[in-house]
Interface confidence: low
């Protein structure tokens, strides 16, 4: 069968696809690009006007087991004098990632994909001021 | 793989590590969280290091749409609304896991893939290198 144009019907499933039981999908957890590294500017969590700390969360029933979460250090932002300016706000920036959750029910084990919201850092924003009449 | 604690009464045939290939339920837990950052907050406009969001779409990946941040300025926005080049807007990058269709076009067969995304920008004091 020829592949129809995208936008009219879907891509046709190739004959070479592995058989998968209904309601499931096959997932290879050998990670592509496993060894790629983040090339962020050095120490930005300390140099930022909205600095943050990192906490490592560990869960042996999750893959990957280690997820790093950021927490903003201040409510306000750090000004040029190194003091906290509470007229501005440090706010978290978040990103979703996928993890595989391993569930034990008695002696049987099942796997579930899960979306996890990770706080990756903080940014300094002008606050939204609500005027009350 | 990683070691998993097991019920001591279970037979020993089960591998304690995550197997290389697993069958997972099609329903993704927490899948209905808001994935469009433009809808979830306006920090990208209100930040002193504002950024634009670019849509990256790949039908061979789940999620098929990922939003990439690009800092608007080299400097940061000061109290007067001008760009201050004594400070730097820098991207905050994060490695995330996505699903890559493998073999290509197969509806229910995937491999985990690690990708690097720029999630937003933050304003930092620059590292100044003094040349002797």
């Amino acid at each position: 069968r020829k592949i129809p144009k995208v936008g009219h019907t879907f891509f046709q499933k190739p004959e070479s696809c592995p058989p998968v039981p209904g309601g499931s999908m096959k997932l290879d957890i050998g990670i592509i690009n496993e060894n790629q590294r983040v090339s962020m500017s050095r120490n930005i969590e300390s140099r930022s006007t909205s600095p943050w700390n990192y906490t490592v969360t560990w869960d042996p029933n999750r893959y990957p087991s280690e997820v790093v979460q950021a927490q903003c250090r201040n409510l306000g932002c750090i000004n040029a004098q190194g003091k906290e300016d509470i007229s501005m706000n440090s706010v978290p920036i978040q990103q979703e990632t996928l993890v595989v959750r391993r569930k034990h029910q008695g002696c049987s084990v099942s796997f579930q994909l899960e979306k996890v919201l990770v706080t990756v850092g903080c940014t300094c924003v002008t606050p939204v001021i609500h005027h009350v009449q | 793989g990683i070691t998993i604690p097991r019920n001591p009464g279970c037979p020993n045939s089960e591998d304690k590590n995550f197997p290389r290939t697993v069958m997972v339920n099609l329903n993704i837990h927490n899948r209905n969280t808001n994935t469009n950052p433009k809808r979830s907050s306006d920090y990208y406009n209100r930040s002193t290091s504002p950024w634009n969001l670019h849509r990256n779409e790949d039908p061979e990946r789940y999620p098929s749409v990922i939003w990439e941040a690009k800092c608007r300025h080299l400097g940061c926005i000061n109290a007067d609304g001008n760009v201050d080049y004594h400070m730097n807007s820098v991207p905050i990058q994060q490695e995330i896991l996505v699903l890559r269709r493998e073999p290509p076009h197969c509806p229910n067969s995937f491999r985990l893939e690690k990708i690097l995304v720029s999630v937003g920008c933050t304003c930092v004091t620059p590292i100044v290198h003094h040349v002797a």
Partner: nanobody
Framework: EVQLVESGGGLVQPGGSLRLSCAAS??????MGWLRQAPGKEREFVAA????????YYADSVKGRFTISKDNSKITMYLQMNSLRPEDTAVYYC?????????????????WGQGTLVTVSS
């Protein structure tokens, strides 16, 4: 914009059958699906069918009991539900989406009907 109108819901006894219909009008789409939401639960995927009608997908919980089909001439999709169980009680939504991919993810459906209530009770 696609307009979707569902019909065919109602009260049925356990073991009984119902046939839901979804009439679509507007621009073309790649796939149509049925999703459902039980009281206090997340919306979940039930079944999907490709724009051509060649490919069908089912949730494990309905496989063998429900059949999705479509009439291309009328741009109408159907869900034949047999051997209904109390746990099938939900509001059933018809939705369209672009692409075959991730038919089980309700986030990927763009246009939704208003829903039709199916109650399975004795």
């Amino acid at each position: 914009e696609v307009q979707l109108v569902e019909s065919g819901g109602g009260l049925v006894q356990p073991g009984g059958s119902l046939r839901l219909s979804c009439a679509a009008s507007g621009r073309t789409y790649d796939a149509m699906g049925w999703l459902r939401q039980a009281p206090g639960k997340e919306r979940e995927f039930v079944a999907a069918i490709s724009g051509s009608g060649d490919d069908t997908y089912y949730a494990d919980s309905v496989k063998g009991r429900f059949t999705i089909s479509k009439d291309n001439s009328k741009i109408t999709m159907y869900l034949q539900m047999n051997s209904l169980r109390p746990e099938d009680t939900a509001v059933y939504y018809c939705a369209t989406r672009r692409g075959l991919y991730y038919v089980w993810d309700s986030n990927d459906y763009e246009n939704w009907g208003q829903g039709t209530l199916v109650t399975v009770s004795s």
